[in-house]
Each structure stands twice: as C-alpha cells, then as structure tokens.
C-alpha cells in the first residue's frame, strides 16, 4: 500500500481521508477540505494543511522582528487557495473580496486590497528563523549535542535534509534554528523548509499532524527539551511591500 502497509491511513497527515481505491487497490489518501491526493511518505504542503484546518481558532501574534524585512504570521488562520500542486496561490482573497499577496509559506506580504490587486508571482520564503525558549533545566544543553539532535529531528521526523538546516544557535534559554533553501537548491524529493517549519510549529504546540505517532519527545542526551514559546520569522527572496501606514 502507498499510505500505510496494513491499515489504510496516512502516517504524515491525520487530516486526510484514505481508502484503497488507488491503482491496483493501493491505499490513496486525500486531504480534507481540498480533496487533493497527498503523498503520505512526505509532508503535506502547508497550504493543504491550512485548508483542512479551517475550524481552528485564530492565533494572532505580534513580534519584534529580527530584520526590517522579516515577516511574522500575525493574521492567523484563513482558508487559502492552493494550486494543483498544493502550493499557495500568490493572491489570496476572503469571502468579502478583500485580497492580499502571500509568500510561499502563505504569510501575507502586502497590504490588503480589493479584487483588482495583482500578485505577479509567488515569492519564495528562502530563510526561516525559528526562535525557541526552553524551560529551565539543571544546566545549559551542550551546543553541539543540541545541534546534532535538531538536525536528526528535522531529517527523521520532517524529512528535511540537514543541508537546509543552516545553523543552530544557542544562548540559554534561547535556541534559534535557521532554515535556508533557495528554489534552485531543491532537488527531487526534497522537503520544503516552509512545510517542515509548519509541522515543527504544530508539534511544539502539541498539535501534531502525524497519524498515530506520539507527540514530539525532544531529548538532548536524555534530558528533555521542553519549549515554552516559539516565534517564527520568515524572510522572502524579494522584500515585502507594505505601506508606511502599517509600519507606524
């Protein structure tokens, strides 16, 4: 079977409906909300996951930005339009014909406008900074152990190759994970950093997207790493276009 060997389920996405109606009676899974077929050997795109998660409450945040062009997902949940490959369409609109442009991780990168708003291309988020604060521990974690454990986690749980984990910074109690990935760097089968970051974010919040797998149990040399808060910053290949009004 394609999805799972014996019971027809999707290990990487519990927000799916699966049935053995694929070629040769193989298990095939479709994302809730969109009905699109998903590959259960890898992460489902963030766009399809957001579409399946329409009922979740808004989670608005305001953050101090690490650079003038960094974006934070302050708008919370919305029902996105996804393209046939499951990626965000560059222009998103709500039911009241308010439209805006988003980046490849679905975060708004322009002021809101009307139906005349043009978004020429989907701008790629090529750098993601995941900022974590961990709960107090007896002592600081060893930096190289922490680095190795996070690289292993991103490879084994999220299938992200370690080449895309650009750096792990640590100043107790703050951990920063830098993910970097240009369009040209992605080879066949490589997971998108935006999808990996989203799965990680949901894991940290105790809202795992994985089917039947336990929640995230992060340990460094046997010592539990418990996260108190997470901030995620997104940097696009082309800086966002907001009016000065928004910045004041």
């Amino acid at each position: 079977h394609t999805a799972a060997q014996d019971n027809c389920t999707c290990p990487t996405n519990k927000m799916t409906v699966c049935s053995p109606d694929g070629p040769g009676g193989r298990c095939q899974c479709r994302a809730l909300g969109s009905g699109m077929a998903v590959d259960c050997s890898t992460l489902t795109s963030k766009c399809l996951l957001l579409k399946a998660r329409m009922s979740a409450p808004k989670n608005a945040r305001t953050l101090v930005r690490p650079s003038e062009h960094a974006l934070v997902d302050n708008d919370g949940l919305y029902d996105p339009d996804c393209d046939p490959e499951g990626r965000f369409k560059a222009r998103q609109c709500n039911q009241t014909s308010v439209c805006w442009c988003v980046n490849s991780v679905g975060v708004r990168r322009t002021d809101k406008g009307d139906l005349s708003l043009r978004c020429d291309e989907l701008v790629r988020t090529h750098h993601i900074l995941i900022d974590l604060r961990h709960r107090p521990t007896a002592g600081a974690f060893n930096h190289s152990d922490l680095d190795a454990e996070l690289r292993r986690l991103f490879r084994e749980r999220y299938r992200l190759h370690p080449k895309f984990v650009a750096a792990v910074h640590y100043e107790q109690p703050t951990i920063q994970i830098e993910l970097r990935q240009n369009t040209s760097q992605k080879a066949a089968g490589d997971v998108d950093i935006g999808d990996a970051a989203y799965y990680f974010e949901r894991d940290i919040k105790g809202e795992s997207l994985f089917q039947g797998r336990g929640g995230l149990d992060l340990r460094v040399r046997g010592e539990p790493l418990q996260v108190e808060r997470t901030l995620i910053y997104y940097l696009d290949e082309i800086p966002p276009k907001f009016s000065m009004k928004r910045l004041t």
């Epitope: 079977h1 394609t2 060997q5 290990p11 050997s41 890898t42 690289r151 292993r152 490879r155 084994e156 299938r159 190759h161 370690p162 080449k163 240009n182 040209s184 760097q185 992605k186 080879a187 066949a188 089968g189 490589d190 997971v191």
Partner: antibody, heavy 119, light 108 residues
Framework: QVQLVQSGAEVKKPGASVKVSCKAS????????MHWVRQAPGQGLEWMGE????????SYNQKFKGRVTITRDTSTSTAYMELSSLRSEDTAVYYC????????????WGQGTLVTVSS | DIQMTQSPSSLSASVGDRVTITCRAS??????LNWYQQKPGKAPKLLIY???RLHSGVPSRFSGSGSGTDFTLTISSLQPEDFATYFC??????????FGQGTKLEIK
C-alpha cells in the same frame, strides 16, 4: 532515457589518488542528488557520499575521514569522486547513482568503475 | 549508524517458487527502506522504494512490506531472470545511508 556513464577502469599504487567521473544525461542534472557507492570484490555495497549538483553541497561517510571529495561540473552534467591516500582495501567497483531526496533511493546507476590498488 | 541485517545470506529455489527475503534495521526506520537487485558484473537496479512502491518497469511479482524495523521482499513466482543478489538499504537517518549485506538467490 536516464543514463549515467562512468570513466574507465584504473590501476593505482598505494598512497596515490584516483578521480572517477560520471556523466549524466536524459534528465536535468541539477534536479537530483548524486551519490557514490562502492563495492569491494565479492562484498556488499557501501555508501560514500552525496552531492546536490545545483549548489555543490556535499556530505560524506565519516568512514573515509576526509579522503573522499565529490565535485560536479554543471556545464557538462558530470559528477566526480576523488579518493586519496589509496590503500589495497580501496580496490573496488565505484558507482555513481542518482538519488531521491525523500526516500534516498538510488533509481539509476552508472555502469561502475573498477579501481585496483596494487603495488 | 543504522545497521541493516538481511536473512538468509543465501538461498536456493526453483523457477515458480515463492521466495521471501527479510531485512532488519537496528532502529526504527519508518518505511524508508529500499530494495535492489544485482546480477554478476552489473550495477544494482532499484526494485522497490519506500518499503512497497515498485520502481518503474519492475514486474508485479516483486512486492515489499514491513514497517519500523522488520521488512520483507517477496517474489511471488520466481522467473529465471530473478536469480541474483538482493540488497536492502535504509534512507531514513542522517547520512551515512546503509545497506544490508546481501542475499544471494541461486537456482536449486
């Protein structure tokens, strides 16, 4: 169709270096990982390292302790594997293989290059 | 590194037989297990990836199953061209990616 064509057999002396080439055709060279795997006579398969041709990123099997270097030339769609400080136990057939980023399966292989290390 | 152990290391069978080769990983590798066939003097060929997915052009008599640490390659009805050596390989962990030691399938 996808093809990986490797350079010919080599005979080297202990302590020398060897550089094996692998020319890819039939697909976009920069869109797939390239791996190198070796097989000593009558033995199993041993993964040596990988490269992403688009940006030249490499990672290696630590067993080779800096003796292996993988490079690529995108203008000719060719990958190279250089092994230095050769010893007799490096006598093997060396293969390049195209890889998938998620499954890490090697779906197409070169024909192999026999490297013999002998004094 | 993750160790991969195949069994048996060799086996004899006849054309038409159903044959099973097993592969065990030293730790959970989810479904990231691939199978290859190699004939003498030739490069390996991918048969099955991600435990059970058939590579293009591979006959349907080959199938794979398993999850976690225990995996199986099954040939439902042996054909003369199937006599070869079979290797499993894990693609789950950080590099290095590791292979089983091989199972030689011979004509009885």
């Amino acid at each position: 169709q996808v093809q990986l064509v490797q350079s010919g057999a080599e005979v080297k002396k202990p302590g020398a270096s060897v550089k094996v080439s692998c020319k890819a055709s039939g697909y976009t060279f920069t869109s797939y990982w390239m791996h190198w795997v070796r097989q000593a006579p009558g033995q199993g398969l041993e993964w040596m390292g990988e490269i992403t041709p688009s940006d030249g990123y490499t990672s290696y099997n630590q067993k080779f302790k800096g003796r292996v270097t993988i490079t690529r030339d995108t203008s000719t769609s060719t990958a190279y594997m250089e092994l230095s400080s050769l010893r007799s136990e490096d006598t093997a057939v060396y293969y390049c293989a195209r890889g998938h980023g998620n499954y890490v399966s090697f779906d197409y292989w070169g024909q192999g290059t026999l490297v013999t290390v002998s004094s | 590194d993750i160790q991969m152990t195949q069994s048996p290391s060799s086996l004899s069978a006849s054309v038409g037989d159903r044959v099973t080769i097993t592969c065990r990983a030293s730790q959970d590798i989810s479904n990231y297990l691939n199978w290859y066939q190699q004939k003498p003097g030739k490069a390996p060929k991918l048969l099955i990836y991600y435990t059970s997915r058939l590579h293009s052009g591979v006959p349907s008599r080959f199938s794979g199953s398993g999850s976690g640490t225990d995996f199986t390659l099954t040939i439902s009805s042996l054909q003369p061209e199937d006599f070869a050596t079979y290797f499993c390989q894990q693609g789950y962990s950080l590099p290095p990616y590791t292979f089983g030691q091989g199972t030689k399938l011979e004509i009885k």
